[in-house]
Protein backbone atom coordinates (compact mmCIF):
# COMPACT_ATOMS: atom_id res chain seq x y z
CA UNK A 1 0.00 0.00 0.00
CA UNK A 2 1.09 3.62 -0.50
CA UNK A 3 2.69 5.41 2.43
CA UNK A 4 1.02 8.56 3.74
CA UNK A 5 3.80 10.55 2.13
CA UNK A 6 5.98 9.12 -0.67
CA UNK A 7 8.85 11.26 0.62
CA UNK A 8 8.97 9.03 3.69
CA UNK A 9 10.52 6.33 1.49
CA UNK A 10 11.96 8.17 -1.50
CA UNK A 11 13.41 11.61 -2.19
CA UNK A 12 15.37 13.65 -4.75
CA UNK A 13 14.91 11.46 -7.81
CA UNK A 14 16.97 13.13 -10.52
CA UNK A 15 19.35 12.69 -13.43
CA UNK A 16 22.98 13.54 -12.88
CA UNK A 17 24.59 13.95 -16.27
CA UNK A 18 28.19 14.71 -17.15
CA UNK A 19 29.62 14.51 -20.68
CA UNK A 20 26.41 12.68 -21.67
CA UNK A 21 26.82 9.93 -19.10
CA UNK A 22 23.35 9.97 -17.58
CA UNK A 23 22.98 8.50 -14.10
CA UNK A 24 19.68 8.37 -12.25
CA UNK A 25 20.16 8.99 -8.53
CA UNK A 26 17.87 9.19 -5.52
CA UNK A 27 17.87 9.23 -1.74
CA UNK A 28 15.94 7.16 0.71
CA UNK A 29 13.43 9.00 2.86
CA UNK A 30 13.39 9.07 6.66
CA UNK A 31 11.54 5.75 6.76
CA UNK A 32 13.77 4.07 4.21
CA UNK A 33 15.88 1.19 5.49
CA UNK A 34 18.89 -0.66 4.06
CA UNK A 35 16.60 -3.45 2.87
CA UNK A 36 14.33 -1.09 0.90
CA UNK A 37 14.51 -2.12 -2.75
CA UNK A 38 14.23 0.14 -5.78
CA UNK A 39 12.99 -0.52 -9.30
CA UNK A 40 13.63 1.86 -12.19
CA UNK A 41 11.58 2.64 -15.29
CA UNK A 42 12.13 5.16 -18.07
CA UNK A 43 10.25 6.54 -21.05
CA UNK A 44 10.34 9.26 -23.69
CA UNK A 45 8.13 12.33 -24.00
CA UNK A 46 4.55 11.54 -24.91
CA UNK A 47 4.91 7.76 -24.69
CA UNK A 48 2.31 5.90 -22.64
CA UNK A 49 4.35 2.96 -21.44
CA UNK A 50 7.18 2.98 -18.96
CA UNK A 51 10.02 0.54 -19.71
CA UNK A 52 11.63 -1.41 -16.88
CA UNK A 53 15.39 -0.94 -16.86
CA UNK A 54 17.14 -4.29 -16.83
CA UNK A 55 19.75 -4.51 -14.11
CA UNK A 56 17.94 -1.89 -12.03
CA UNK A 57 15.04 -3.92 -10.66
CA UNK A 58 14.73 -4.56 -6.91
CA UNK A 59 18.18 -3.12 -6.28
CA UNK A 60 19.39 -1.70 -2.97
CA UNK A 61 21.88 0.83 -4.36
CA UNK A 62 20.66 4.36 -5.03
CA UNK A 63 21.79 4.92 -8.58
CA UNK A 64 21.17 3.47 -12.02
CA UNK A 65 23.08 4.15 -15.24
CA UNK A 66 20.62 5.13 -17.99
CA UNK A 67 23.21 6.40 -20.46
CA UNK A 68 22.34 3.90 -23.20
CA UNK A 69 18.60 4.29 -22.73
CA UNK A 70 18.77 8.10 -22.91
CA UNK A 71 21.21 8.40 -25.79
CA UNK A 72 19.08 10.32 -28.30
CA UNK A 73 20.28 13.93 -28.11
CA UNK A 74 17.04 15.44 -29.37
CA UNK A 75 14.72 13.36 -27.18
CA UNK A 76 13.15 14.23 -23.85
CA UNK A 77 13.22 11.50 -21.22
CA UNK A 78 11.74 10.71 -17.85
CA UNK A 79 12.72 8.11 -15.31
CA UNK A 80 10.91 6.99 -12.21
CA UNK A 81 11.82 4.99 -9.15
CA UNK A 82 9.53 2.75 -7.15
CA UNK A 83 10.71 2.03 -3.62
CA UNK A 84 9.35 -0.95 -1.72
CA UNK A 85 10.15 -1.30 1.97
CA UNK A 86 10.62 -4.58 3.79
CA UNK A 87 7.16 -4.07 5.27
CA UNK A 88 5.60 -3.87 1.82
CA UNK A 89 5.04 -0.11 1.70
CA UNK A 90 5.74 1.49 -1.66
CA UNK A 91 6.33 4.92 -3.16
CA UNK A 92 6.95 6.09 -6.72
CA UNK A 93 8.61 9.30 -7.83
CA UNK A 94 9.63 10.56 -11.25
CA UNK A 95 12.22 12.96 -12.60
CA UNK A 96 11.55 16.20 -14.36
CA UNK A 97 11.86 16.09 -18.15
CA UNK A 98 15.46 15.37 -19.01
CA UNK A 99 17.29 16.57 -22.10
CA UNK A 100 20.92 15.50 -22.19
CA UNK A 101 21.84 18.41 -24.47
CA UNK A 102 20.33 20.86 -22.06
CA UNK A 103 21.20 19.27 -18.74
CA UNK A 104 24.56 17.56 -19.13
CA UNK A 105 27.50 19.31 -17.48
CA UNK A 106 30.97 19.36 -18.98
CA UNK A 107 33.95 17.79 -17.29
CA UNK A 108 37.32 19.54 -17.47
CA UNK A 109 39.06 18.93 -20.80
CA UNK A 110 41.95 16.51 -21.13
CA UNK A 111 45.02 18.67 -21.76
CA UNK A 112 48.74 18.14 -22.12
CA UNK A 113 50.84 21.10 -20.99
CA UNK A 114 54.36 21.21 -22.44
CA UNK A 115 57.10 23.42 -21.04
CA UNK A 116 59.55 25.21 -23.31
CA UNK A 117 62.15 27.83 -22.51
CA UNK A 118 60.14 30.92 -23.33
CA UNK A 119 56.72 29.44 -24.00
CA UNK A 120 54.20 26.92 -22.76
CA UNK A 121 52.28 24.78 -25.22
CA UNK A 122 48.86 23.38 -24.40
CA UNK A 123 47.35 20.56 -26.44
CA UNK A 124 43.65 19.84 -25.86
CA UNK A 125 42.61 16.26 -26.53
CA UNK A 126 39.15 15.55 -27.97
CA UNK A 127 36.64 14.55 -25.32
CA UNK A 128 34.87 11.27 -26.09
CA UNK A 129 31.22 10.75 -25.11
CA UNK A 130 29.03 7.64 -24.95
CA UNK A 131 26.91 9.02 -27.80
CA UNK A 132 27.23 7.02 -30.99
CA UNK A 133 26.88 8.22 -34.56
CA UNK A 134 24.80 6.34 -37.13
CA UNK A 135 27.85 4.29 -38.15
CA UNK A 136 28.54 3.31 -34.53
CA UNK A 137 31.58 5.44 -33.78
CA UNK A 138 31.62 7.48 -30.58
CA UNK A 139 31.07 11.20 -30.91
CA UNK A 140 33.27 13.75 -29.19
CA UNK A 141 31.98 16.88 -27.49
CA UNK A 142 33.31 18.80 -30.49
CA UNK A 143 31.15 16.66 -32.80
CA UNK A 144 28.05 17.39 -30.74
CA UNK A 145 28.52 21.09 -30.01
CA UNK A 146 29.47 22.87 -33.21
CA UNK A 147 30.10 26.17 -31.45
CA UNK A 148 32.35 24.64 -28.79
CA UNK A 149 35.55 26.55 -28.12
CA UNK A 150 38.36 26.47 -25.60
CA UNK A 151 39.29 29.27 -23.26
CA UNK A 152 42.85 29.20 -21.95
CA UNK A 153 44.39 31.39 -19.32
CA UNK A 154 47.96 31.58 -18.08
CA UNK A 155 48.51 33.21 -14.71
CA UNK A 156 51.82 35.05 -15.05
CA UNK A 157 51.74 36.76 -11.67
CA UNK A 158 49.14 38.01 -9.23
CA UNK A 159 48.09 40.89 -11.45
CA UNK A 160 48.69 39.65 -14.98
CA UNK A 161 47.11 36.87 -16.99
CA UNK A 162 47.49 35.93 -20.62
CA UNK A 163 44.46 34.67 -22.53
CA UNK A 164 44.01 32.52 -25.60
CA UNK A 165 40.91 30.96 -27.10
CA UNK A 166 39.55 29.26 -30.14
CA UNK A 167 38.32 26.06 -31.71
CA UNK A 168 41.72 24.61 -32.53
CA UNK A 169 43.37 22.03 -30.31
CA UNK A 170 46.91 23.43 -30.01
CA UNK A 171 47.87 26.69 -28.31
CA UNK A 172 51.09 28.31 -27.22
CA UNK A 173 51.76 31.16 -24.82
CA UNK A 174 54.90 33.00 -25.95
CA UNK A 175 57.19 35.60 -24.43
CA UNK A 176 57.55 33.96 -21.05
CA UNK A 177 60.44 34.18 -18.63
CA UNK A 178 62.61 31.05 -18.51
CA UNK A 179 62.76 28.91 -15.38
CA UNK A 180 59.50 30.39 -14.04
CA UNK A 181 56.40 28.66 -12.74
CA UNK A 182 53.00 29.43 -14.30
CA UNK A 183 49.47 28.26 -13.64
CA UNK A 184 47.40 27.34 -16.69
CA UNK A 185 43.64 26.86 -16.75
CA UNK A 186 41.72 25.50 -19.71
CA UNK A 187 37.93 25.43 -20.02
CA UNK A 188 35.44 24.20 -22.57
CA UNK A 189 32.74 26.73 -23.51
CA UNK A 190 29.50 26.11 -25.43
CA UNK A 191 27.71 29.47 -25.84
CA UNK A 192 24.46 28.25 -27.40
CA UNK A 193 23.78 26.01 -24.42
CA UNK A 194 25.35 28.37 -21.86
CA UNK A 195 27.76 25.63 -20.83
CA UNK A 196 31.17 26.05 -19.30
CA UNK A 197 33.28 23.17 -18.02
CA UNK A 198 35.16 23.11 -14.79
CA UNK A 199 38.76 24.13 -15.53
CA UNK A 200 41.63 21.79 -16.18
CA UNK A 201 44.61 23.19 -14.30
CA UNK A 202 48.28 22.61 -14.92
CA UNK A 203 51.15 24.12 -12.99
CA UNK A 204 54.12 24.23 -15.30
CA UNK A 205 57.59 25.73 -15.22
CA UNK A 206 59.37 27.08 -18.25
CA UNK A 207 62.71 25.43 -18.94
CA UNK A 208 65.89 27.18 -17.84
CA UNK A 209 67.70 29.11 -20.56
CA UNK A 210 70.84 26.99 -21.15
CA UNK A 211 72.21 29.36 -23.79
CA UNK A 212 73.79 31.50 -21.07
CA UNK A 213 75.55 28.71 -19.20
Amino acid sequence: HAPEDPSDLLQHVKFQSSNFENILTWDSGPEGTPDTVYSIEYKTYGERDWVAKKGCQRITRKSCNLTVETGNLTELYYARVTAVSAGGRSATKMTDRFSSLQHTTLKPPDVTCISKVRSIQMIVHPTPTPIRAGDGHRLTLEDIFHDLFYHLELQVNRTYQMHLGGKQREYEFFGLTPDTEFLGTIMICVPTWAKESAPYMCRVKTLPDRTWT
Epitope: Y45, G46, E75, Y78, A91, T92, K93, M94, D96, R97
Partner: antibody, heavy 116, light 113 residues
Framework: EVQLVESGGGLVQPGGSLRLSCAAS????????MNWVRQAPGKGLEWIGE????????TYNQKFKGRFTISVDQSKNTAYLQMNSLRAEDTAVYYC?????????WGQGTLVTVSS | DIVMTQSPDSLAVSLGERATINCKSS????????????LAWYQQKPGQPPKLLIY???SRESGVPDRFSGSGSGTDFTLTISSLQAEDVAVYYC?????????FGQGTKVEIK
Protein backbone atom coordinates in the same frame (compact mmCIF):
# COMPACT_ATOMS: atom_id res chain seq x y z
CA GLU B 1 -8.88 2.26 -11.65
CA VAL B 2 -7.51 5.79 -12.12
CA GLN B 3 -9.89 8.51 -10.93
CA LEU B 4 -9.54 12.27 -10.64
CA VAL B 5 -12.09 14.24 -8.62
CA GLU B 6 -12.11 18.04 -8.57
CA SER B 7 -13.68 20.11 -5.81
CA GLY B 8 -13.64 23.64 -4.46
CA GLY B 9 -15.58 25.42 -7.19
CA GLY B 10 -18.40 27.83 -6.54
CA LEU B 11 -19.41 31.45 -6.67
CA VAL B 12 -16.74 34.04 -5.98
CA GLN B 13 -16.71 37.82 -6.28
CA PRO B 14 -14.45 39.62 -8.75
CA GLY B 15 -11.03 40.16 -7.19
CA GLY B 16 -11.54 37.17 -4.93
CA SER B 17 -9.55 33.94 -4.58
CA LEU B 18 -10.38 30.27 -4.75
CA ARG B 19 -8.42 27.04 -4.31
CA LEU B 20 -9.48 24.02 -6.34
CA SER B 21 -8.51 20.48 -5.40
CA CYS B 22 -7.95 17.42 -7.55
CA ALA B 23 -7.93 14.18 -5.58
CA ALA B 24 -6.26 11.31 -7.44
CA SER B 25 -7.02 7.67 -6.72
CA UNK B 26 -6.05 4.38 -8.31
CA UNK B 27 -2.43 5.46 -8.72
CA UNK B 28 0.25 7.49 -6.96
CA UNK B 29 0.00 11.14 -8.00
CA UNK B 30 3.82 11.30 -8.05
CA UNK B 31 3.96 8.74 -10.88
CA UNK B 32 2.72 11.07 -13.67
CA UNK B 33 2.41 14.77 -14.52
CA MET B 34 -0.79 16.64 -13.65
CA ASN B 35 -2.41 19.47 -15.62
CA TRP B 36 -5.21 21.97 -15.17
CA VAL B 37 -7.44 22.83 -18.14
CA ARG B 38 -10.47 25.11 -18.17
CA GLN B 39 -13.54 25.51 -20.34
CA ALA B 40 -15.67 28.66 -20.33
CA PRO B 41 -19.42 28.07 -20.79
CA GLY B 42 -20.09 27.05 -24.38
CA LYS B 43 -16.44 27.60 -25.30
CA GLY B 44 -13.33 25.56 -26.05
CA LEU B 45 -10.55 24.15 -23.89
CA GLU B 46 -7.69 26.20 -22.49
CA TRP B 47 -4.55 24.74 -20.91
CA ILE B 48 -3.56 26.49 -17.67
CA GLY B 49 -0.40 24.64 -16.71
CA GLU B 50 1.20 21.46 -15.42
CA UNK B 51 3.09 20.17 -12.42
CA UNK B 52 5.45 17.29 -11.85
CA UNK B 53 4.02 16.12 -8.53
CA UNK B 54 7.29 14.41 -7.60
CA UNK B 55 9.42 17.54 -7.79
CA UNK B 56 6.93 20.40 -7.69
CA UNK B 57 8.28 21.75 -10.99
CA UNK B 58 5.58 23.73 -12.77
CA THR B 59 5.07 25.14 -16.26
CA TYR B 60 2.33 27.68 -16.90
CA ASN B 61 0.51 29.15 -19.82
CA GLN B 62 1.86 32.71 -19.73
CA LYS B 63 -1.72 33.98 -19.71
CA PHE B 64 -2.20 32.62 -16.18
CA LYS B 65 1.28 33.10 -14.72
CA GLY B 66 1.23 35.24 -11.60
CA ARG B 67 -2.48 34.80 -10.86
CA PHE B 68 -2.76 31.01 -10.84
CA THR B 69 -0.51 28.61 -8.90
CA ILE B 70 -0.42 24.82 -9.19
CA SER B 71 0.79 22.74 -6.27
CA VAL B 72 0.62 19.21 -4.86
CA ASP B 73 0.29 17.56 -1.48
CA GLN B 74 1.91 14.16 -1.99
CA SER B 75 0.65 12.81 1.32
CA LYS B 76 -2.95 13.55 0.26
CA ASN B 77 -2.43 12.37 -3.35
CA THR B 78 -3.98 15.69 -4.35
CA ALA B 79 -3.15 18.53 -6.73
CA TYR B 80 -4.34 22.11 -6.26
CA LEU B 81 -5.04 25.18 -8.35
CA GLN B 82 -4.85 28.44 -6.41
CA MET B 83 -6.60 31.24 -8.30
CA ASN B 84 -6.21 34.87 -7.26
CA SER B 85 -7.57 38.22 -8.52
CA LEU B 86 -10.42 36.43 -10.23
CA ARG B 87 -12.33 38.16 -13.03
CA ALA B 88 -15.66 37.51 -14.71
CA GLU B 89 -13.85 35.96 -17.69
CA ASP B 90 -12.41 33.27 -15.39
CA THR B 91 -15.90 31.77 -15.12
CA ALA B 92 -15.45 28.23 -16.40
CA VAL B 93 -15.42 24.54 -15.61
CA TYR B 94 -11.95 23.65 -14.34
CA TYR B 95 -10.59 20.18 -15.03
CA CYS B 96 -7.52 18.40 -13.78
CA UNK B 97 -6.04 16.04 -16.36
CA UNK B 98 -3.20 13.55 -16.15
CA UNK B 99 -0.12 13.02 -18.29
CA UNK B 100 2.78 14.98 -19.70
CA UNK B 101 1.76 15.78 -23.29
CA UNK B 102 -1.82 14.85 -24.10
CA UNK B 103 -4.28 13.95 -21.35
CA UNK B 104 -5.36 10.38 -20.75
CA UNK B 105 -7.53 10.82 -17.65
CA TRP B 106 -9.72 13.81 -16.79
CA GLY B 107 -11.76 14.69 -13.74
CA GLN B 108 -15.44 15.56 -14.09
CA GLY B 109 -14.64 19.23 -13.56
CA THR B 110 -15.69 21.85 -11.03
CA LEU B 111 -17.59 25.03 -11.98
CA VAL B 112 -16.18 28.38 -10.93
CA THR B 113 -18.48 31.38 -11.32
CA VAL B 114 -17.00 34.85 -10.86
CA SER B 115 -19.77 37.37 -10.37
CA SER B 116 -20.84 40.17 -8.05
CA ASP C 1 1.74 30.24 -29.23
CA ILE C 2 0.76 27.61 -31.79
CA VAL C 3 -2.73 28.33 -33.11
CA MET C 4 -4.93 25.33 -33.86
CA THR C 5 -7.78 25.90 -36.33
CA GLN C 6 -10.47 23.29 -36.87
CA SER C 7 -12.89 23.03 -39.78
CA PRO C 8 -15.77 22.89 -40.10
CA ASP C 9 -17.20 24.41 -36.90
CA SER C 10 -20.10 21.98 -37.16
CA LEU C 11 -20.92 18.95 -39.23
CA ALA C 12 -24.16 17.02 -39.84
CA VAL C 13 -23.71 13.46 -41.09
CA SER C 14 -26.16 10.63 -41.66
CA LEU C 15 -25.88 7.54 -39.49
CA GLY C 16 -23.43 5.07 -41.03
CA GLU C 17 -21.80 7.77 -43.16
CA ARG C 18 -18.25 9.10 -42.91
CA ALA C 19 -17.47 12.22 -40.88
CA THR C 20 -14.23 14.10 -41.49
CA ILE C 21 -12.85 16.85 -39.23
CA ASN C 22 -9.79 18.90 -40.13
CA CYS C 23 -7.27 20.55 -37.87
CA LYS C 24 -4.57 22.95 -39.02
CA SER C 25 -1.66 24.16 -36.88
CA SER C 26 0.18 27.46 -37.33
CA UNK C 27 3.51 25.59 -37.34
CA UNK C 28 4.72 22.06 -37.91
CA UNK C 29 4.04 19.56 -35.13
CA UNK C 30 6.57 17.01 -36.40
CA UNK C 31 8.77 15.93 -33.48
CA UNK C 32 12.24 15.24 -34.87
CA UNK C 33 13.17 12.67 -32.20
CA UNK C 34 10.63 10.07 -33.31
CA UNK C 35 9.30 11.55 -36.58
CA UNK C 36 5.80 11.57 -35.08
CA UNK C 37 3.40 14.48 -34.88
CA UNK C 38 2.51 15.97 -31.50
CA LEU C 39 -1.23 16.01 -32.03
CA ALA C 40 -4.11 14.52 -30.03
CA TRP C 41 -7.86 14.31 -30.63
CA TYR C 42 -10.56 14.36 -27.95
CA GLN C 43 -14.31 13.73 -27.89
CA GLN C 44 -16.51 15.69 -25.49
CA LYS C 45 -20.15 14.90 -24.88
CA PRO C 46 -22.46 17.38 -23.10
CA GLY C 47 -21.82 17.58 -19.36
CA GLN C 48 -18.77 15.32 -19.57
CA PRO C 49 -15.02 15.89 -19.61
CA PRO C 50 -13.10 15.37 -22.84
CA LYS C 51 -12.09 11.81 -23.67
CA LEU C 52 -8.79 11.00 -25.39
CA LEU C 53 -9.31 9.31 -28.76
CA ILE C 54 -6.04 9.66 -30.69
CA TYR C 55 -2.46 10.67 -29.84
CA UNK C 56 0.67 11.05 -31.97
CA UNK C 57 -1.78 12.06 -34.71
CA UNK C 58 -2.73 8.46 -35.55
CA SER C 59 -2.36 6.19 -32.47
CA ARG C 60 -5.74 5.10 -31.18
CA GLU C 61 -6.26 5.15 -27.44
CA SER C 62 -7.03 1.80 -25.84
CA GLY C 63 -10.76 1.07 -25.88
CA VAL C 64 -11.57 3.56 -28.63
CA PRO C 65 -13.60 1.97 -31.48
CA ASP C 66 -11.64 1.43 -34.69
CA ARG C 67 -14.09 3.57 -36.66
CA PHE C 68 -12.08 6.51 -35.27
CA SER C 69 -8.83 7.17 -37.08
CA GLY C 70 -6.36 10.02 -37.25
CA SER C 71 -4.06 11.01 -40.09
CA GLY C 72 -1.93 13.87 -41.33
CA SER C 73 1.51 15.32 -40.75
CA GLY C 74 3.26 18.63 -40.31
CA THR C 75 0.48 21.22 -40.11
CA ASP C 76 -2.58 19.43 -41.53
CA PHE C 77 -4.45 16.72 -39.67
CA THR C 78 -7.72 14.83 -40.00
CA LEU C 79 -9.97 12.88 -37.66
CA THR C 80 -12.19 10.44 -39.51
CA ILE C 81 -15.22 8.60 -38.17
CA SER C 82 -15.70 5.93 -40.82
CA SER C 83 -19.31 5.06 -39.98
CA LEU C 84 -21.06 7.53 -37.71
CA GLN C 85 -23.00 6.06 -34.79
CA ALA C 86 -25.59 7.84 -32.63
CA GLU C 87 -23.21 7.78 -29.66
CA ASP C 88 -20.61 9.74 -31.67
CA VAL C 89 -22.63 12.95 -31.41
CA ALA C 90 -20.22 15.24 -29.56
CA VAL C 91 -17.75 18.08 -29.91
CA TYR C 92 -14.30 17.05 -31.11
CA TYR C 93 -11.09 18.92 -30.28
CA CYS C 94 -7.54 18.67 -31.56
CA UNK C 95 -4.62 19.56 -29.28
CA UNK C 96 -0.95 20.16 -29.95
CA UNK C 97 1.75 19.14 -27.49
CA UNK C 98 4.71 20.19 -29.60
CA UNK C 99 5.45 23.27 -27.51
CA UNK C 100 4.21 25.28 -24.54
CA UNK C 101 1.59 26.42 -24.03
CA UNK C 102 -0.33 23.36 -25.13
CA UNK C 103 -3.23 24.60 -27.26
CA PHE C 104 -6.55 23.25 -28.51
CA GLY C 105 -8.62 23.83 -31.60
CA GLN C 106 -11.92 25.65 -31.14
CA GLY C 107 -13.87 22.41 -31.53
CA THR C 108 -16.09 20.81 -34.18
CA LYS C 109 -19.66 19.83 -33.34
CA VAL C 110 -20.80 16.58 -34.97
CA GLU C 111 -24.54 15.97 -35.27
CA ILE C 112 -26.81 13.46 -36.97
CA LYS C 113 -28.37 14.58 -40.24
Amino acid sequence: EVQLVESGGGLVQPGGSLRLSCAASGYSITAEYMNWVRQAPGKGLEWIGEINPSTGTTTYNQKFKGRFTISVDQSKNTAYLQMNSLRAEDTAVYYCARFDAYFDYWGQGTLVTVSS
Amino acid sequence: DIVMTQSPDSLAVSLGERATINCKSSQSLLYSSNQKNCLAWYQQKPGQPPKLLIYWASSRESGVPDRFSGSGSGTDFTLTISSLQAEDVAVYYCQQYYSYPFTFGQGTKVEIK
